[in-house]
Amino acid sequence: PRSIEVKYIGVKSAYVSYDAEKRTIYLNITNTLNITNNNYYSVEVENITAQVQFSKTVIGKARLNNITNIGPLDMKQIDYTVPTVIAEEMSYMYDFCTLLSIKVHNIVLMMQVTVTTAYFGHSEQISQERYQYVDCGRNTTYQLAQSEYLNVLQPQQ
């Protein structure tokens, strides 16, 4: 068998809402993956499991099942959404994300994704992880891979 390639493309969109009383941020993050089947036979994408970390804490998980079939020598682009919650011991982020004196509220998130494929009864798992910038201050739609190159606010040294 030839390889199945999984390429994490980046964040497609991030939709944000807040709970002022709980000082909680809800971020629905939609990511894009390219999965390429280099084989001469079809491959089933059984599931995609994803999680998002902020500051080494898991803030969201998602699992998609029975996703799609990828034909021989074909590639499919798949979007998946991870609902995330920034709360409790990270509630200090609420002030940052809702601060109006800042124009862009970029935070660094670690995106982890595992794709499980199957062919002829054999399963294979491919994992990727990537740090991405996401704006927690407003709803944002990104050009593909744009969120890799955004600036994150840093205090002067």
């Epitope: 944000v16 809402s17 807040y18 002022a20 200090y92 982020m93 002030d95 940052f96 809702t98 601060l99 109006l100 004196s101 800042i102 124009k103 935070i107 201050g137 407003r138 606010l153 840093q154 205090p155 002067q156």
Partner: antibody
Framework: EVQLQQSGAELMRPGASVKLSCTAS????????MYWVKQRPEQGLEWIGR????????EYAPKFQGKATMTADTSSNTAYLQLSSLTSEDTAVYYC???????????????WGQGTSVTVSS | DVLMTQIPLSLPVSLGDQASISCRSS???????????LEWYLKKPGQSPKLLID???NRFSGVPDRFSGSGSGTDFTLKISRVEAEDLGVYYC?????????FGGGTKLEIK
């Protein structure tokens, strides 16, 4: 240390113009909106406006449209407030302010200059 | 513009008393992001304003817990549970939801 340092007191003649400065240290003004506030003697606080130092885009309270002009120079990390056609009504203390992120934990700090006193007198 | 009206203009209190200041906005001050940017400042003579409360009830860092904010819609209140000498000064409510941002007229907290 995060702070805003304003220029010194000004004594001006009616009809003249004055330009006040507000220099930031500990953060880059281009990452933030900068605000100006006026307080006349024995009076309340008045919001003059805000500027985006990155592109110079400014928004004013209607009362200060035509009276105040906000500018910024990101290379010197300084915001400016120019007041034109001065009258006794412009005698006041003027403050610059913003709210900044002051550490790696995204914590916020309300930051004000010490104020610049402008006296208009013939 | 959003008009911010504070009551009372002057509030004489004895040290240790509770003080309550009211602020009313001429329209709702909910920002498009769903937050209400209603803030309270204390201004003392010769000093810059000091932020006490933001987003209605969020006590800013370093502010004693005797200060509390409440309210919704167009009616907001600042309470000081036990007034101390260092609390004297002029209190201003402020809305930072809609440009142009606006301050209330101020309430002077003074000793009876």
């Amino acid at each position: 240390e995060v702070q805003l340092q304003q220029s010194g007191a000004e004594l001006m003649r009616p009809g003249a113009s004055v330009k006040l400065s507000c220099t930031a240290s500990g953060f880059n003004i281009q990452d933030y909106y900068m605000y100006w506030v006026k307080q006349r003697p024995e009076q309340g606080l008045e919001w003059i406006g805000r500027i985006d130092p990155e592109d110079g885009d400014a928004e004013y309270a209607p009362k200060f449209q035509g009276k105040a002009t906000m500018t910024a120079d990101t290379s010197s990390n300084t915001a400016y407030l120019q007041l034109s056609s001065l009258t006794s009504e412009d005698t006041a203390v003027y403050y610059c302010s913003t709210r900044v992120i002051y550490d790696g934990y995204y914590r916020t700090m309300d930051c004000w200059g010490q104020g610049t006193s402008v006296t208009v007198s013939s | 513009d959003v008009l911010m009206t504070q009551i009372p203009l002057s509030l004489p209190v004895s040290l240790g008393d509770q003080a309550s200041i009211s602020c009313r906005s001429s329209q709702t001050i909910v920002h498009s992001n769903g937050n209400t940017y209603l803030e309270w400042y204390l201004k003392k003579p010769g000093q810059s304003p000091k932020l006490l409360i933001d987003k209605i009830s969020n006590r800013f860092s370093g502010v004693p817990d005797r200060f509390s904010g409440s309210g919704s819609g167009t009616d907001f209140t600042l309470k000081i549970s036990r007034v101390e000498a260092e609390d004297l000064g002029v209190y201003y409510c402020f809305q930072g939801s809609h440009v142009p941002y606006t301050f209330g007229g101020g309430t002077k907290l003074e000793i009876k």
